[in-house]
Interface confidence: low
């Protein structure tokens, strides 16, 4: 396809408290150039979960090496899930811009639900 698509294959993921949640996201094209960000929620009040470009996100690890050229897999894993992490997570592609990057396209979202820790 000519135009980049952001694919979040799972509509929902259920994880037990204390476990790690893997949220999958893939791009269909390298261009336009720009970083990927993950958010919980949508709109002005959304919470930044991961920024490929900068920042420190101690609970988040990437499934593949994002700094490598040709990478189209932007899946993340969030460790030590708690009920407060429940919500819909969006993988968002930004277009390289100056001075600020511009939001280009968002995935459809993956709803994370948190089950009680097994006793």
């Amino acid at each position: 396809e000519d135009e980049l698509q952001v694919i979040q294959p799972e509509k929902s993921v259920s994880v037990a408290a204390g476990e790690s949640a893997t949220l999958r996201c893939a791009m269909t094209s390298l261009i336009p150039v720009g970083p990927i960000m993950w958010f919980r929620g949508a709109g002005a009040g959304r919470e930044l979960i991961y920024n490929q470009k900068e920042g420190h996100f101690p609970r988040v690890t990437t499934v593949s090496e994002l700094t490598k050229r040709n990478n189209l897999d932007f899946s993340i894993s969030i460790s030590n899930i708690t009920p407060a992490d429940a919500g819909t997570y969006y993988c968002v592609k930004f277009r390289k811009g100056s001075p600020d990057d511009v939001e280009f396209k968002s995935g459809a979202g993956t709803e994370l639900s948190v089950r009680a820790k097994p006793s």
Partner: antibody, heavy 118, light 107 residues
Framework: QVQLVQSGAEVKKPGASVKVSCKAS????????MHWVRQAPGQGLEWMGW????????NYAQKFQGRVTMTRDTSISTAYMELSRLRSDDTAVYYC???????????WGQGTLVTVSS | EIVLTQSPATLSLSPGERATITCRAS??????LAWYQQKPGQAPRLLIY???NRATGIPARFSGSGSGTDFTLTISSLEPEDFAVYYC?????????FGGGTKVEIK
């Protein structure tokens, strides 16, 4: 050093196909996208598409979709561009170009002249 | 697709003179623009990327500036080997597109 060496000039008849090769050396072939760009005689540069040598995934310019096929052979670090149903206006120099660390096209192959003539 | 318009089409100058080539994009490409040099019978060579960064091994007499829709390539003092065709290219939007080229010829 990073080098791209292309196959030699070709003369084809209208309706035929041509397959141009681009052999890479001096870097990890599967680590960088390869693009193809063509240049008609006395004209400018026209992007045709790219191939991800790692996965084999491709992305073609709309103009060439259905006529172009980009492939690769990782065992010999070579990318290929095949153009079918050739017309006289496909006469051009065809270049492969590696997508460099800064996202731009660097370096380029030396070019392959494809002449389409009856 | 993004259209890049270069001007002038031809620039006639003498060695030692300053060359200024402009590239205008049909919509903003931020700073995501490159310049290439092509000599007769040769492949293009990357000169400037991200509007103003010189590629490896490119002499300091080449400089690039601009952002948004208007960009400039400047050669501060032309050397004999600089007479060639210069192309701008954008990669912010798909598909990547090139300008029509500017020929810098000896006056």
């Amino acid at each position: 050093q990073v080098q791209l060496v292309q196959s030699g000039a070709e003369v084809k008849k209208p309706g035929a196909s041509v397959k141009v090769s681009c052999k890479a050396s001096g870097y990890t072939f599967t680590g960088y996208y390869m693009h193809w760009v063509r240049q008609a005689p006395g004209q400018g540069l026209e992007w045709m598409g790219w191939i991800n040598p790692n996965s084999g995934g491709t992305n073609y310019a709309q103009k060439f979709q259905g006529r172009v096929t980009m492939t690769r052979d990782t065992s010999i670090s070579t990318a290929y561009m095949e153009l079918s149903r050739l017309r006289s206006d496909d006469t051009a120099v065809y270049y492969c170009a590696r997508e460099g660390d800064e996202d731009w096209f660097d370096p380029w192959g030396q070019g392959t002249l494809v002449t389409v003539s009856s | 697709e993004i259209v890049l318009t270069q001007s002038p089409a031809t620039l006639s100058l003498s060695p030692g003179e300053r060359a200024t080539i402009t590239c205008r994009a049909s919509q903003s490409v931020s700073s995501y623009l490159a310049w290439y040099q092509q000599k007769p019978g040769q492949a293009p060579r990357l000169l400037i990327y991200d509007a103003s960064n010189r590629a490896t091994g490119i002499p300091a007499r080449f400089s690039g500036s601009g952002s948004g829709t208007d960009f400039t390539l400047t050669i501060s003092s032309l050397e004999p080997e600089d007479f060639a065709v210069y192309y701008c290219q954008q990669r912010l939007f798909h598909p990547p597109t090139f300008g029509g080229g500017t020929k810098v010829e000896i006056k």
